[in-house]
Each structure stands twice: as structure tokens, then as C-alpha cells.
Interface confidence: low
């Protein structure tokens, strides 16, 4: 499969446009917005028919080095009663984002962007039945 | 990827820190290359929370295309169809980092961006403000 | 944090209308969600209407045809014109929303929010 290439033909290169040698990308890491503290509507992964827990990931050699992932906790959805009900389904809702890898090759080191898909929360859908013919 | 000497001498102890600016290969390593949820699943149809989606585009950012959920009611579907008033429904946010082209319009000249996306939505007991 | 403030509430004659109006102000980023619930004399709150940030709309069955909900995004403001009022929709009317909003350099993705209410009295 061809690996997307995040480079754009179609911009025109302003002449203020730093040089970079070919086949690369410079890319600076002081991330835009990274102050913005964010809180969901509180405790909503308790709180939802569909609860989930979450994990963090550490890894020292990927920027962020903090990538926290959700688990759904229930094979199906909790009731109006606290009781789970396995006619409907707990799933995972997932998104892509970004991160750069750091390799070491020898007393050299190269960095990656690779993409990562987050399990960001878990929501309650009604089951696809599979009719046995 | 693009190789960076480090440091002479080559010192054992692992680089705590990323440095501000790197260089990195044009390629992007990746097994997720289906962006559109619309195609990945139908659970924003399927949901007890449904929601629709609604197509973001920037050519100054990659992804270009960022899909973001809207929640289709304040409450959650029942077992009957009907919309239930005594739950609600609630979009669930991420922050997600991507690329903002900077100086704007270079071709390989990228900021890392946090942004904040809806992915979905779920069905939540709504906290109950009493009134005094 | 978030207030909602509604208006136009009053004494009508059965048949008449009225013109509900309800503003969110704050440090709202996004507001998903606008709309209007009642409450009548010795009964629970009910949904009157909602508007989505899509511009889509839900009316309970007892409203449909009569009531008409709208929006106004630049000013953070829904309406709710009332036509065709009768005796039982008399109710104190609660603004609602759910709002994304910045409070203490925090950001509450989504959250409802109430207005204080605004009596509307249908009756001959």
C-alpha cells in the first residue's frame, strides 16, 4: 500500500519558506494550543450506559510520551436498573492522531510521524444481527 | 527517516527531551489510512446516542480532512425508537495533534497542533441541577 | 460560566400568541443543544422544543403545528413563537441548553444548562 505523503504539490512555495533537504520535513514540536486543559462533561465515562475506563501508555521515545486509551468495560449496556443488558452492545468509538517516534540508529537518531488510533470512549448501539441461513 | 548526529562522543544516557525542531521523513507510518468514519463503522446510526457527521476542511492543516460529530438529540434513543428526555446525550472530545503549515502555504514546514474534535457521541444520567 | 436568561412570558387569551426568547452569555465556546421545557402546576418538566447546532429541530406531539422553534447563532439566542395557545399549555417555561464552554481556563465540553423560567398563563 502507498504511504501518504503530507506534502502538497498544489502549494505554491513562498519564498520565506525555510529549506529542507529532500524527502524530509521540518517540523517544530512546540505544540500550538498545548495549554488548553480540557474536561468532558464530568464523569461522563461513569456516568454513560456504555462506561469505560482508561489506561495511559508511556513511551519515553514517542512525543507526546503520554497516550491515554479508553477500555469499554461492558460487553453490553447498562440499564435503566444499574444491570448490564447484553442485547445491546458496548463499542468502542476510536480517532487517528498524530505522533512522532524517536529511533536511534547507531549514535544517530531519526524521527518518524506515525499515526496513532485512540480509543477516546465507548457508546451503546443496537446490535447487527447475523441471520444463520 | 532522516538521520540527526547526536551529541559527540555519542553519551550513554537516554535524551530526556525532544528537541523543539526536528526533521522527519515525508512519509508517515501508519496502518489507519481509512479517515472517513462514515465508511470505518455505521455506529453513528446504530448509537442509543446517534450523531452525524460533519466534514472539516483545511488544506493549511494535515489531515486536510477532519471528520467531527454533532449529537442528533439532547436525549437518547430508547428501546421503543422514541427520544428519552431523562438521559442525555453527549458528545465525547478529544484532543488530537496534527499539522499546521507554518510559515503558512510551505509545503514542508509543519507546527505540531492540539485540537479539539468531537469523535461521537454517548448516552449519559444527566447530572440533576436542584434548584434552591 | 454560563448564564441563560428568558423573556416574553406573560397572560394570553386562549388562541392568542406569545414570543419566548432566551440568550446564553458566558464564555461559551460552542452551544450544541438550545431549547425550551415546561413545567405546569403539580407536574414534572417536559420537553417543549429543541433546536440542533445543524438547524434541525424536535417538538413534542402536543406542540407540532402550533410552536415554532428558532435560532439565532450571532447572538447566541433561541426563540419559541407560541400560536394557537391554549389553557393547557400554561407552565412555567425553562430555557435549556448544552454548552461547551471555558470556565477557569478549563473547558467543559458539554454541559445543560437552565434558565431561571418565565410563566406563561393562558386563560380567558
Known amino acids: 500500500r502507498k504511504i501518504p505523503k503530507v506534502g502538497h504539490t498544489f502549494f505554491q512555495k513562498p519564498e520565506s519558506c525555510p529549506p529542507v533537504p529532500g524527502g524530509s520535513m521540518k517540523l517544530d514540536i512546540g505544540i500550538i494550543n498545548e495549554n488548553q486543559r480540557v474536561s468532558m462533561s464530568r464523569n461522563i465515562e461513569s456516568r454513560s450506559t456504555s462506561p469505560w475506563n482508561y489506561t495511559v501508555t508511556w513511551d519515553p521515545n514517542r512525543y507526546p510520551s503520554e497516550v491515554v486509551q479508553a477500555q469499554c468495560r461492558n460487553l453490553g449496556c447498562i440499564n435503566a436498573q444499574g444491570k448490564e443488558d447484553i442485547s445491546m452492545n458496548s463499542v468502542p468509538i476510536q480517532q487517528e492522531t498524530l505522533v512522532v517516534r524517536r529511533k536511534h540508529q547507531g549514535c544517530s537518531v531519526s524521527f518518524q510521524l506515525e499515526k496513532v488510533l485512540v480509543t477516546v470512549g465507548c457508546t451503546c448501539v443496537t446490535p447487527v444481527i447475523h441471520h444463520v441461513q | 527517516g532522516i538521520t540527526i548526529p547526536r551529541n559527540p562522543g555519542c553519551p550513554n544516557s537516554e535524551d530526556k527531551n525532544f528537541p523543539r525542531t526536528v526533521m522527519v521523513n515525508l512519509n508517515i507510518h501508519n496502518r489507519n489510512t481509512n479517515t472517513n468514519p462514515k465508511r470505518s463503522s455505521d455506529y453513528y446510526n446504530r448509537s442509543t446516542s446517534p450523531w452525524n457527521l460533519h466534514r472539516n476542511e483545511d488544506p493549511e492543516r494535515y489531515p486536510s480532512v477532519i471528520w467531527e460529530a454533532k449529537c442528533r438529540h439532547l436525549g437518547c434513543i430508547n428501546a421503543d425508537g422514541n427520544v428519552d428526555y431523562h438521559m442525555n446525550s453527549v458528545p465525547i472530545q478529544q484532543e488530537i495533534l496534527v499539522l499546521r503549515r507554518e510559515p503558512p502555504h510551505c509545503p514542508n514546514s509543519f507546527r505540531l497542533e492540539k485540537i479539539l474534535v468531537s469523535v461521537g457521541c454517548t448516552c449519559v444520567t444527566p447530572i440533576v441541577h436542584h434548584v434552591a | 460560566e454560563v448564564q441563560l436568561v428568558e423573556s416574553g412570558g406573560g397572560l394570553v387569551q386562549p388562541g392568542g400568541s406569545l414570543r419566548l426568547s432566551c440568550t446564553a452569555s458566558?464564555?461559551?465556546?460552542?452551544?450544541?443543544?438550545m431549547g425550551w421545557y415546561r413545567q405546569a402546576p403539580g407536574k414534572q418538566r417536559e420537553l417543549v422544543a429543541l433546536?440542533?447546532?445543524?438547524?434541525?429541530?424536535d417538538y413534542a406531539d402536543s406542540v407540532k403545528g402550533r410552536f415554532t422553534i428558532s435560532r439565532d447563532n450571532s447572538k447566541n439566542t433561541v426563540y419559541l413563537q407560541m400560536n394557537s395557545l391554549r389553557a393547557e399549555d400554561t407552565a412555567v417555561y425553562y430555557c435549556?441548553?448544552?454548552?461547551?464552554?471555558?470556565?477557569?481556563?478549563?473547558?467543559?465540553?458539554?454541559?445543560?444548562?437552565w434558565g431561571q423560567g418565565t410563566l406563561v398563563t393562558v386563560s380567558s
Open positions: 435549556a441548553a448544552e454548552i461547551g464552554y471555558y470556565s477557569g481556563g478549563t473547558y467543559y465540553s458539554s454541559e445543560a444548562h
Open positions: 458566558g464564555t461559551i465556546v460552542n452551544i450544541h443543544v
Open positions: 433546536i440542533f447546532s445543524g438547524g434541525s429541530a
